[in-house]
């Protein structure tokens, strides 16, 4: 009984199309596949950033695969050929591994790359990124930001830099069409007359860095002798009501502080008839139904009632 063997895929490589971390892994069928003409060959691909403990594994019938990587580190990948049992009239067969690596040759020392990169997607409308220059770099150093997400033909450079002392320290992005719920890739590189500057790569999803506007139109309504309903409206902009969580801070008579987190634009507060003053503020954040993370808005303007009988009227700002 001859043992059936199959070769690994040929010409396995990682190709960088210039998308700042979104890479193509590609290969060719193994040699001597003639024996398995009636057979659908599959490939098991394992890949990771160097230093990561776990491999990502996929099985595909294709000769290519695409995924995002952290270009601050190297990438390693391996692939082998898989023959289902139908190909061999027995048990499944797998080839040895073909392996490849990819990394961007780093220029400059790590300290020269930008520090404290921070990106915020204001009100799910305006993306702004800011950074500090690298440690010990001279004033002639300038940084340039490039970005890409699926849907763009190629990486684009920032066209509206925020400057300080002639240096680029941030970027105001233009309107980013169909850019949420997908990986957003950024590279900040630099140039200096004196020394090479290390590039930095960042990846995030825009819906996870949203900072909404604060809620508006805060009002009070007496519901009963011991209940007051606090109400507010969602901030103006594209974020739907179903995407908000709210945090409320309530002060009664300058003493009691109540904080609560709610999903709706109302909160019912138990009070006594002796309450002389009531103030509250609200802030908003994108919730778990619309994102994996988010940034709290600023607090709303304070809305207060004082000195009048809450049971007599509805209180508006």
């Amino acid at each position: 009984d001859t043992e059936i063997k199959v070769n690994p895929p040929q010409d396995f490589e990682i190709v960088d199309p210039g998308y700042l971390g979104y890479l193509y892994l590609q290969w060719q069928p193994p040699l001597s596949l003639d024996h398995f003409k009636e057979c659908t060959v599959e490939y098991e691909l394992k890949y990771r950033n160097i230093g990561s403990e776990t491999w990502k594994t996929i099985i595909t019938k294709n000769l290519h695969y695409k995924d995002g990587f952290d270009l601050n580190k190297g990438i390693e990948a391996k692939i082998h050929t898989l023959l289902p049992w139908q190909c061999t009239n027995g048990s499944e067969v797998q080839s040895s591994w073909a392996e490849t690596t990819y990394w961007i040759s780093p220029q400059g020392i790590p300290e020269t790359k930008v520090q404290d990169m921070d990106c915020v997607y204001y009100n799910w409308q305006y993306l702004l990124c800011s950074w500090k220059p690298g440690i010990g770099v001279l004033l002639d150093t300038n940084y340039n930001l490039f970005y890409w997400y699926e849907g763009l033909d190629h990486a684009l450079q920032c066209v509206d830099y925020i400057k300080a002392d002639g240096q680029n320290i941030g970027c105001r992005f233009p309107y980013l069409e169909a850019s949420d719920y997908k990986d957003f890739y950024i590279c900040v590189n630099g140039s200096s007359e004196n020394k090479p500057i290390r590039s930095s790569y960042f990846t995030f999803q825009l819906q996870n860095i949203v900072k909404p506007l604060p809620p508006v139109y805060l009002t009070f309504t007496r519901e009963s002798s011991c209940e007051i309903k606090l109400k507010w409206s969602i901030p103006l902009g594209p974020i739907p009501a179903r995407c908000f969580d709210y945090e409320i801070e309530i002060r009664e008579d300058d003493t009691t502080l109540v904080t609560a987190t709610v999903e709706n634009e109302t909160y019912t507060l138990k009070t006594t008839n002796e309450t002389r003053q009531l103030c509250f503020v609200v802030r908003s954040k994108v919730n778990i139904y619309c994102s994996d993370d988010g940034i709290w808005s600023e607090w709303s303007d304070k809305q207060c009632w004082e000195g009048e009988d809450l049971s007599k009227k509805t209180l508006l700002r």
């Epitope: 595909t60 019938k61 294709n62 695969y65 289902p84 049992w85 139908q86 048990s91 499944e92």
Partner: antibody, heavy 121, light 108 residues
Framework: EVQLLESGGGLVQPGGSLRLSCAAS????????MTWVRQAPGKGLEWVSA????????YYADSVKGRFTISRDNSKNTLYLQMNSLRAEDTAVYYC??????WGAGAFDYWGQGTLVTVSS | DIQMTQSPSTLSASVGDRVTITCRAS??????LAWYQQKPGKAPKLLIY???SLESGVPSRFSGSGSGTEFTLTISSLQPDDFATYYC??????????FGQGTKVEIK
């Protein structure tokens, strides 16, 4: 005639464990890949896990990775799913499924009748 | 992950109608697509594999077509036994294997 018969479902508390079994007959069990597919009440189909014919390779959905373990005993013609750290969202009918063609998955040509797993306190 | 999107979600039809259900993949899956029929309280049943191959024992009024990202399941003349929920499934690249959300074919 191909038959797949699941067992082991039932009511379990959140954080608890359960082991599903699937007794197979009517085909050479050691050859095809096998999978588990689940269906939450009133919802669609969700692939859970797959295992190759030899049992040498296993694959999992992200939602169960690290909590569920698929295995098979080819001498007993039986497929297993060990489910640990169960959550309310694992409540579903679990189907044992034979892969028609392919290494670890493909079109699913035979399905068991399903066993209901309910995770509730 | 490859997303599978079926349309419509619900389809009202009469016996004898020609019925078409569409399945769209978020990226090309060649012809690695299957269609299933599921009746309430029962396990799904394979109808079509490799986008257009009819599973043994399935009536010839069922047919599948398409490749790449667009696929259709057609029932040439709807029979009373065909009122059910239909699912598409890709097996081009996994894990995960992914299914469409289902299309319920109900009596008009």
């Amino acid at each position: 005639e191909v038959q797949l018969l699941e067992s082991g479902g039932g009511l379990v508390q959140p954080g608890g464990s359960l082991r599903l079994s699937c007794a197979a007959s009517g085909f050479t069990f050691r050859r095809p890949a096998m999978t588990w597919v689940r269906q939450a009440p009133g919802k669609g189909l969700e692939w859970v896990s797959a295992i190759t014919g030899s049992g040498g390779s296993t694959y999992y959905a992200d939602s169960v990775k690290g909590r569920f373990t698929i295995s098979r005993d080819n001498s007993k013609n039986t497929l297993y799913l060990q489910m640990n750290s169960l959550r309310a969202e694992d409540t579903a009918v679990y189907y044992c499924v034979k892969v028609r063609y392919g290494w670890g998955a493909g079109a699913f040509d035979y399905w068991g009748q399903g066993t209901l797993v309910t995770v509730s306190s | 992950d490859i997303q599978m999107t079926q349309s419509p979600s619900t389809l009202s039809a009469s016996v004898g109608d020609r019925v078409t259900i569409t399945c769209r993949a978020s990226q090309s899956i060649s012809s690695w697509l299957a269609w299933y029929q599921q009746k309430p309280g029962k396990a799904p049943k394979l109808l079509i594999y490799d986008a257009s191959s009819l599973e043994s024992g399935v009536p010839s009024r069922f047919s599948g077509s398409g490749s790449g990202t667009e696929f259709t399941l057609t029932i040439s003349s709807l029979q009373p036994d065909d009122f059910a929920t239909y699912y598409c499934q890709q097996y081009d690249t996994y894990p995960p294997i992914t299914f469409g959300q289902g299309t319920k074919v109900e009596i008009k």
